[in-house]
């Protein structure tokens, strides 16, 4: 089954993805759609690389922002909504037949959370609920959501490393920060 | 507007050949996944072949491997399926589409008949 | 190869009632599926993909639903020009299947 990330309405959601260039700088086109992978190619394509650069996005809220020559084809999708919520393939399309690389995705967007700071709470929590914790070269993992904040940490494995994912409770306790869930 | 328009049919014997053509216009075809589907007289639907863009990638249905060659030609906007080694069950009509994974556009079909 | 199984075979509906069709598979195919119509004499129109998308042009009347291995297209309100046969598509596995149709016929 394929992978979880979540983001809040509003914020950019990142959904990883990536291979290894080989030779280095050899890119292979990459296609991104809405919905499971499918035999061929994608469908409903949201954004398409060739061997050099992007070449067809439907909107300009999805974005390559890693190192693309590098093989770092994780989509961001910028101010994301309800609706952006479902599956997504990403498919590297290695040349040769039924040589492609297919990884399911899955997006869930929720509302923002209602959070209540203290009075000496001088940040923004808002930017701070749900958070992208970046861990090593792989830029960020899954989201970390309020509403169930375990005291542990939490493995995620996904296609390419194992994460691990810190909670934000020991932050907010100190803040002073009443959290409620929307 | 597309327009699918595919040619070729007709009567052939048991272990003959036939190329079958499709003319392609109101979209840019070099854009597409192109395919075959075929329907047996009075039976349902059955995919036969598809071919990538720029015709690199051509997949079969375990059938006709062997026996069928799908190809295209981009500056002419045109699809073929070069049947050879024809079979009585290979007898349907014979559809074009464009698409990879489900098809939006189809021809009017050609009718092939394999027959002694 | 996947099989995908349609029932009924044959649908008698009055004009003006509501029409379901079943696709149904062994295995998950999450929304990679397709409906198409088939008049006889001509070639099929798509009708719905990704489960539950209607194609361009296609009437509202018209709706897809289901994921995984169970699927249903449903015609709200049937008009004369619907009666034909219905068949569903999968694209989630090679090779790409058809069911083997449901016929909708006048009541």
């Known amino acids: 089954s394929e992978v979880e990330y979540i983001a809040e309405v509003g914020q950019n959601a990142y959904l990883p993805c990536s291979y290894t260039p080989a030779p280095p700088g050899n890119l292979v086109p990459v296609c991104w759609g809405k919905g499971a992978c499918p035999v061929f190619d994608c469908s409903n394509v949201v954004l398409r690389t060739d061997n050099r650069d992007v070449n067809d996005r439907t909107s300009g809220r999805y974005w390559l922002k890693g190192d693309f020559h590098k093989g770092d084809v994780s989509l961001t999708i910028e101010n994301v909504t309800l609706a952006d919520s479902g599956v997504y393939c990403c498919r590297i399309q290695i040349p040769g037949i039924m040589n492609d690389e297919k990884h399911n995705v899955k997006l869930v967007v929720i509302k923002p959370a209602k959070v209540t700071p203290a009075p000496t709470l001088q940040r923004d929590l808002t930017s701070a609920f749900p958070r992208m914790l970046t861990t090593g070269e792989h830029g960020p993992a899954e989201t970390q959501t309020p509403g169930s904040l375990p005291d542990v940490n939490l493995t995620v494995s996904n296609f390419f490393c194992e994460l691990q994912i810190f909670t934000l409770t020991n932050e907010l306790r100190d803040s002073g920060a009443t959290i409620r869930t929307a | 507007e597309v327009q699918l328009v595919e040619s070729g049919g007709g009567l052939v014997q048991p272990g003959g050949s036939l190329r079958l053509s499709c003319a392609a216009s109101g979209f840019t075809f070099s854009n597409s996944w192109m395919t075959w589907v075929r329907q047996a007289p009075g039976k349902g639907l059955e995919w036969v072949a598809n071919?990538?863009?720029?015709?690199?990638?051509?997949y079969y249905v375990d059938s006709v491997k062997g026996r069928f060659t799908i190809s295209r030609d981009n500056a002419k906007n045109s699809l073929y399926l070069q049947m050879n080694s024809l079979r009585a069950e290979d007898t349907a009509v014979y559809y074009c589409?464009?698409?990879?994974?489900?098809?939006?556009?189809w021809g009017q079909g050609t009718l092939v008949t394999v027959s002694s | 190869e996947i099989v995908m199984t349609q029932s009924p075979a044959t649908l008698s509906v009055s004009p003006g009632e509501r029409a379901t069709l079943s696709c149904r598979a062994r295995?998950?195919?999450?929304?990679?599926l397709a409906w198409y119509q088939q008049k006889p004499g001509q070639a099929p129109r798509l009708l719905i993909y990704g489960a539950s998308t209607r194609a361009t042009g296609i009437p509202a009347r018209f709706s897809g639903s289901g994921s995984g291995t169970e699927f249903t297209l449903t015609i709200s309100s049937l008009q004369s020009e619907d009666f034909a046969v219905y068949y569903c598509?999968?694209?989630?596995?090679?090779?790409?299947?058809f069911g083997g149709g449901t016929k909708v016929e006048i009541k």
């Open positions: 295995q998950n195919f999450y929304s990679n």
């Open positions: 589409n464009s698409g990879s994974n489900y098809f939006d556009y």
């Open positions: 598509q999968q694209y989630n596995n090679w090779p790409l299947t």
């Open positions: 071919i990538k863009q720029a015709g690199t990638e051509k």
